[in-house]
Structures are given as structure tokens and as C-alpha cells.
Interface confidence: medium
């Protein structure tokens, strides 16, 4: 028996359902009584779901997995994972045994889009040319860690004096806070782009600062 899985990682959004595809080619006269199907975590060998002795043995993994029972006889051994969590990310092995056996691993990549960034200024009033301004760009509840880019009003990248921190919450999702310290000219526009590298999703935020005149 030959087991086939998709070579590309399966990308699943947090809280959605994902299908880890796995198939085999049954011989003529194949019956489910002959099938031993095991899904397990590749690294730890933890059992996720199994079909043995002619019946679905159910989920051994947080009761969020299911097979496609009506399709098994056709060679579809795919696994449905419900309400995907960050902790589900990783490699899953589909192990099929009929008379001989084969296995293959499929990778699950979990993702969550970042929120539209909110922009804050410090100080936020009495801004004058030559003043240092701290601009904070905050975006929430994304996964995996974001890439953050700053640009000025002309689209020129701003790489100096940027500090970015990313903290995971209890669900494993990241809140990103990127701080740009700039010197204010007469006026200026500053843009922050938060990119999810898996989803190739960009979230944009910008702020325009108009400096007040200097007085002696």
C-alpha cells in the first residue's frame, strides 16, 4: 500500500477546521475490516486518531478530530481537525496498514491575521520641529510572529531607532508593539506595516504629525 499526502503544509486559521489529507489506493475487494489507520504526532508519536478492527476508535487528541468514514473504503484516510489552536501546529503522520504498510507526514501550519494597527504618539500635543516623538504601532491577536516595517511619507524605509516586542497571550496568539523614535521635521507621515509571514497579510497603520512653530 502506498500512502500519499500533500507535500505543502496545510495552513489553517485559528478557530477554523482543517483537513489533513491522506490517501491510499485500495486493492479490489478491499474491506474496512482489513484497515489499520493511525494518525499520530510525528515527533512525539502521540496518538491522535485511529481506525482499527473495522471501526473508528475515535479521537485520542482533545476530542477535536474526525475521519471521513464514508470515504475510507475509497482510500480517503484524511483527518479533520476542528477548532484549530496554535498548539496544534506541527507534523502529523498518517500510518496505513492493510497487508503491508506505509506512512507519510503532513505539516500543519497555524495562522491568525493581525488586527489593523493602532497608532499612538508620545508626546501627543505641543509637537515642535526637532522634538523627539515616540510612535507606537500596536497590532493584536496574530500568529505566527509578525514582521514589522516602518516607512516615512515618501515610502522610504525607517530602520533605525525601532524597537519591536511580541508577546504571546494564553492562546499563543501574539500582540505586537513596535516603537519608532523619530525627530519631527516641519511635518511628517509615518506608516507601520504589520505582516503575517504565513498568510502574506499586511495590516497598515499611519499617523501624520504637523509640527507647531518654535518660539524663543
Amino acid at each position: 500500500v502506498e500512502v500519499q499526502v500533500s507535500e505543502d503544509p496545510v495552513v489553517a486559521l485559528v478557530d477554523t477546521d482543517a483537513t489533513l489529507r491522506c490517501s491510499f489506493s485500495p486493492e479490489p475487494g478491499f474491506s474496512l475490516a482489513q484497515l489499520n489507520l493511525i494518525w499520530q504526532l510525528t515527533d512525539t508519536k502521540q496518538l491522535v486518531h485511529s481506525f482499527t478492527e473495522g471501526r473508528d476508535q475515535g479521537s485520542a487528541y482533545s476530542n477535536r478530530t474526525a475521519l471521513f468514514p464514508d470515504l475510507l473504503v475509497q482510500g480517503n484516510a484524511s483527518l479533520r481537525l476542528q477548532r484549530v489552536r496554535v498548539t496544534d501546529e506541527g507534523s502529523y503522520t498518517c500510518f496505513v496498514s492493510i497487508q503491508d504498510f506505509d506512512s507519510a507526514a503532513v505539516s500543519l501550519q497555524v495562522a491568525a491575521p493581525y488586527s489593523k494597527p493602532s497608532m499612538t504618539l508620545e508626546p501627543n500635543k505641543d509637537l515642535r520641529p526637532g522634538n523627539m516623538v515616540t510612535i507606537t504601532c500596536s497590532s493584536y491577536q496574530g500568529y505566527p510572529e509578525a514582521e514589522v516595517f516602518w516607512k516615512d511619507g515618501q515610502g522610504v524605509p525607517l530602520t533605525g531607532n525601532v524597537t519591536t516586542s511580541q508577546m504571546a497571550n494564553e492562546r499563543g496568539l501574539f500582540d505586537v508593539h513596535s516603537v519608532l523614535r523619530v525627530v519631527l521635521g516641519a511635518n511628517g507621515t509615518y506608516s507601520c506595516l504589520v505582516r503575517n509571514p504565513v498568510l502574506q497579510q499586511d495590516a497598515h497603520g499611519s499617523v501624520t504629525i504637523t509640527g507647531q512653530p518654535l518660539t524663543f
Partner: nanobody
Framework: DVQLVESGGGLVQPGGSLRLSCAAS????????MGWFRQAPGKGVEWVST????????YYADSVKGRFTISRDNAKNTLYLQLNNLKTEDTAMYYC?????????RGQGTQVTVSS
């Protein structure tokens, strides 16, 4: 008390150069961003340039970009401004300032006059 003393100003012809210095004392110079400002006769105060504490990032007003260069020597507690290709409109009193323009954080100034 913060003390900032500018020097290096003078009379120079258009196209000429000058190097301004600002000797700092009374605070930990290497920890602070520093800036240059200027005030032309009858005009308001204009920001010229700023440098971060380590000296790795510099900022310039559009009017001086490509002609002026700000630098610092943290070992000597000194801020510099190199003025090249001077124009008559650069005539002004030049002040250095600790971080930004505010009372108690700036010097008394050094006069730069550009004239033929």
C-alpha cells in the same frame, strides 16, 4: 545644571564651510540625543539637525540636507555641526540643545554670517 557652550561661528563667503562645536557639561552627555537649531534675523527658530545618543542616527531639516553634517564625540562631551556649501540664507544664530528646543536645555548660540 546643564551647560552648553557653542563655538566656531564666524563670517564666511557663500560656498564656504564652517565647523560648529558645542561643549556639554552638567549631564551624562552620552545618554542624550542632541540637536542644532538656528534663528535668522527677524525669523522664528528653525530646527536644523538631531543626532541620537550613540551617534548612529542623524536627522536633518530639508533646507540643510546634503550640506550640513551633525556628529558627536561622547568621550569629549562635544557635539559638532559641519556646515558646507553655505548660502546667504544660512545666516543665523546657531544653538545646540539637549534633546529638543526648551528653556534650560540650550546654549547661548554662535553667530554664523554668510556674506560676500
Amino acid at each position: 545644571d546643564v551647560q552648553l557652550v557653542e563655538s566656531g561661528g564666524g563670517l564666511v563667503q557663500p560656498g564656504g564651510s564652517l565647523r560648529l562645536s558645542c561643549a556639554a557639561s552638567g549631564f551624562t552627555f552620552s545618554r542624550y540625543w542632541m540637536g542644532w537649531f538656528r534663528q535668522a534675523p527677524g525669523k522664528g527658530v528653525e530646527w536644523v539637525s538631531t543626532i541620537n545618543s550613540g551617534g548612529g542616527s542623524t536627522y536633518y531639516a530639508d533646507s540643510v540636507k546634503g550640506r550640513f553634517t551633525i556628529s558627536r564625540d561622547n568621550a569629549k562631551n562635544t557635539l559638532y555641526l559641519q556646515l558646507n556649501n553655505l548660502k546667504t540664507e544660512d545666516t543665523a544664530m546657531y544653538y545646540c540643545a539637549k534633546e529638543q528646543w526648551r528653556t534650560g536645555s540650550r546654549g547661548q548660540g554662535t553667530q554664523v554670517t554668510v556674506s560676500s
